[in-house]
Amino acid sequence: MRRGPRSLRGRDAPAPTPCVPAECFDLLVRHCVACGLLRTPRPKPAGASSPAPRTALQPQESVGAGAGEAALPLPGLL
């Protein structure tokens, strides 16, 4: 099942500062940066048949909450 984007907020750490759209939370520096500065997957153009460039990640068929493709690229961190 496809899930909506989820944030990096969770029970195991304080919630990161919410990022504005087009920004992503970088765990290594622990603040928001332009998503373009991170290797965020780019969506395929409509009708594209090849895998999206810049990523070798894909979701498992039965992904648990917050683990799959829908988690990328986490802009906004609502």
Epitope: L8, D12, P16, V29, L37, G66
Partner: antibody, heavy 118, light 111 residues
Framework: QVQLQESGPGLVKPSQTLSLTCTVS????????WNWIRQHPGKGLEYIGY???????YYNPSLKSRVTISRDTSKNQFSLKLSSVTAADTAVYYC????????????WGQGTLVTVSS | DIVLTQSPATLSLSPGERATLSCRAS??????????MNWFQQKPGQAPRLLIY???NRATGIPARFSGSGSGTDFTLTISSLEPEDFAVYYC?????????FGGGTKVEIK
């Protein structure tokens, strides 16, 4: 498709500085994190450090005093220097890059064996 | 540093059998609701290959017989039915915090 290729001398003398370069194609090193990892013969993997999109660096504390990672954005390359090497630094050296947001190293170079010997 | 301990060190199995590999972390690798645990396969003379990221997600091109599970400190990589090409060394790796660390590896060998 992102490709990484390590290059540099395969033989370094003790007490000298090991220098390796990773050439990246298919992506810009001004985005993401660019890492060095090594593997001693027949052993496990050891993380060395990274240089980031901004040029900031992180070095594993176990090697920090001897390591320098730098980059040349015009050539889309990043480099590793390890000083005062000994035989214990003989290893296969890999460059690798993780994706976001899971920081899983999905792209690797093929590795280059560096032997420290006189 | 987060220490990862893999068991067993060696697993001797036959093609078609199920392989269960374990990785235990010295502290939780969960953060922001994500388990930052990854699994790699390495064959002699080759670079490690990402199999599983974020504990349970297969990387591109990885067959469905590979699956990952776990959270917190205890993680498992399962190969449901071993193929001849699956005999290799498997490493877990945490990407919760630097220095990123690897387990010592589990060698899956032909019985």
């Amino acid at each position: 498709q992102v490709q990484l290729q390590e290059s540099g001398p395969g033989l370094v003398k003790p007490s000298q500085t090991l220098s390796l370069t990773c050439t990246v194609s298919g992506d810009s090193i001004t985005s993401g994190y660019w890492n060095w990892i090594r593997q001693h013969p027949g052993k496990g993997l050891e993380y060395i450090g990274y240089i980031s999109y901004s040029g900031s660096t992180y070095y594993n504390p176990s090697l920090k005093s001897r390591v320098t990672i730098s980059r040349d954005t015009s050539k889309n390359q990043f480099s590793l220097k390890l000083s005062s090497v000994t035989a214990a630094d003989t290893a296969v050296y890999y460059c690798a890059s993780p994706n976001y947001p899971f920081y899983a190293m999905d792209y690797w170079g093929q590795g280059t064996l560096v032997t420290v010997s006189s | 540093d987060i220490v990862l301990t893999q068991s067993p060190a060696t697993l001797s199995l036959s093609p078609g059998e199920r392989a269960t590999l374990s990785c235990r972390a010295s502290e939780s690798v969960d953060n922001y609701g994500i388990s930052f645990m990854n699994w790699f396969q390495q064959k002699p003379g080759q670079a490690p290959r990402l199999l599983i990221y974020a504990a349970s997600n297969r990387a591109t091109g990885i067959p469905a017989r590979f699956s990952g599970s776990g959270s917190g400190t205890d993680f498992t990589l399962t190969i449901s039915s071993l193929e001849p090409e699956d005999f290799a060394v498997y490493y877990c790796q945490q990407s919760k915090e630097v220095p990123w660390t690897f387990g010592g590896g589990t060698k899956v060998e032909i019985k």
